[in-house]
Interface confidence: medium
């Protein structure tokens, strides 16, 4: 005869384990169903009743089949500086990330909690380590022999255009410029840039100098001025 | 380097004020994120209040709601604690720390409610 | 009462492999935020010493490690030194509380 099919609630042989999507209730000592993903255990099983599910209340959710009394609360709303990348449904949690131009500083497992304005280098600095979805832009001084005229997350330190002959020497912020109609040869045509991140947060290592010896990250940023740059004449 | 001087700290009997500041240098102040931490004689850290970068919002722990206010003068790079009806519990070294990771510390100022 | 909770004291041989638990809730560490923890030596101010569940500040020794898992985290400080008696704190932010939240605090003795 074809081994019975157990129906919930039911007490399991003695060192085998409850099937898929069921759980082993300690007080009941039954093996007892979960419930689904959206729902959550209203009423716990008993040795003659099995689990009792009811769907998430709005702003809850879970993932997973469960045995939850309560559902799990949805995040708090996407702010201005952020993209809801996923809804909160009874099923998921809500996801936010950064919008471009912004970093994670404070990063939850999915997604981000609060976001940051990538640093500007100010004229006199480039940039020496792009920001990411989770770090900050990092900025240098342009050492001799290169400039940056921008105030900019992008824009890195330039050579100086060579010049036949020099009217104006260069320095960090402003390029040579040159008493002949053109260069002999122009190592600058036009401005580097690095390429934006989505999102994310600081690194706290400083590989290279830096105006400001800490990165900035911070916490919920209402959409609002930009920050000051990040820059030679400092705080 | 990062450096933050708090200020303002003394004695104060419960129910008084006390005002404390912290000056910052050493980084863009006005783009950071800034929070005062305190800890009561022999005791744990405890977070007390985060200011925006632009001072548009701030968070408070429950125990100092409606009696303590966080500001900031970003043209003077000093971050404010503005503490009234002050009680015994809240003696403490108050530190004001930069960034969600509290990443930056100050020396702390002792404020002590007493009568 | 601290949210995040952590064995008040630990101690250690120098030399020695210490590790430091910290344990949080679903509105914390298992919201899925990161753990930071924060060294203080007697007399001064904390110091960040970990970030992000297991990132060093630079100047921060590879002695020191972090990790975390579900609702717990822990700070494992290997080849113990006598310089790193102090207290540990682990915090992480807390959604119900909107704010950053603090260990109790752990004392770690070297013997």
């Known amino acids: 005869l074809p081994a019975q099919v157990a129906f919930t609630p039911y007490a399991p042989e003695p060192g085998s384990t409850c099937r898929l999507r069921e759980y082993y209730d300690q007080t009941a000592q039954m093996c007892c169903s979960k419930c689904s993903p959206g729902q959550h255990a209203k009423v716990f099983c008993t040795k003659t009743s099995d689990t009792v599910c009811d769907s998430c209340e709005d702003s809850t959710y879970t993932q997973l089949w469960n045995w939850v009394p309560e559902c799990l609360s949805c995040g708090s709303r996407c702010s201005s500086d952020q993209v809801e990348t996923q809804a909160c449904t009874r099923e998921q949690n809500r996801i936010c990330t950064c919008r471009p131009g912004w970093y994670c500083a404070l990063s939850k497992q999915e997604g981000c909690r609060l976001c940051a304005p990538l640093r500007k280098c100010r004229p006199g600095f480039g940039v020496a380590r792009p920001g990411t979805e989770t770090s900050d832009v990092v900025c240098k001084p342009c050492a001799p022999g290169t400039f940056s005229n921008t105030t900019s997350s992008t824009d890195i330190c330039r050579p100086h255009q060579i010049c036949n002959v020099v009217a104006i020497p260069g320095n960090a912020s402003m390029d040579a410029v040159c008493t002949s109609t053109s260069p002999t040869r122009s190592m600058a045509p036009g401005a580097v840039h690095l390429p934006q991140p989505v999102s994310t947060r600081s690194q706290h290592t400083q590989p290279t100098p830096e105006p400001s010896t800490a990165p900035s990250t911070s916490f919920l940023l209402p959409m609002g001025p930009s920050p000051p740059a990040e820059g030679s004449t400092g705080d | 380097e990062v450096q933050l001087l708090e200020s303002g700290g003394g004695l104060v009997q419960p129910g008084g004020s006390l005002r404390l500041s912290c000056a910052a240098s050493?980084?863009?102040?006005?783009?950071?994120?800034m929070s005062w931490v305190r800890q009561a004689p022999g005791k744990g850290l405890e977070w007390v209040a985060l200011i925006w970068y632009d001072g548009s919002n701030k968070y408070y722990a429950d125990s100092v709601k409606g009696r303590f206010t966080i500001s900031r003068d970003n043209s003077k790079n000093t971050l404010y604690l503005q503490m009234n009806s002050l009680r015994a519990e809240d003696t403490a070294v108050y530190y004001c720390?930069?960034?969600?990771?509290?990443?930056?510390w100050g020396q702390g100022t002792l404020v002590t409610v007493s009568s | 009462q601290s949210v995040l909770t952590q064995p008040p004291s630990a101690s250690g041989t120098p030399g020695q492999r210490v590790t430091i638990s910290c344990t949080g809730r679903s509105s914390n560490i298992g919201a899925g935020y990161d753990v930071h923890w924060y060294q203080q030596l007697p007399g001064t101010a904390p110091k960040l010493l970990i970030y992000?569940?297991?990132k060093r500040p630079s100047g921060v020794p590879d002695r020191f490690s972090g990790s975390k898992s579900g609702t717990s985290a822990s700070l494992a400080i290997s080849g113990l030194r006598s310089e790193d008696e102090a207290d540990y704190y682990c915090a992480a932010w807390d959604d119900s509380l909107n704010g950053p939240v603090f260990g109790g605090g752990t004392k770690l003795t070297v013997l």
């Open positions: 992000d569940n297991n």
């Open positions: 720390a930069k960034d969600p990771l509290f990443d930056s």
């Open positions: 050493g980084f863009t102040f006005s783009s950071n994120y």
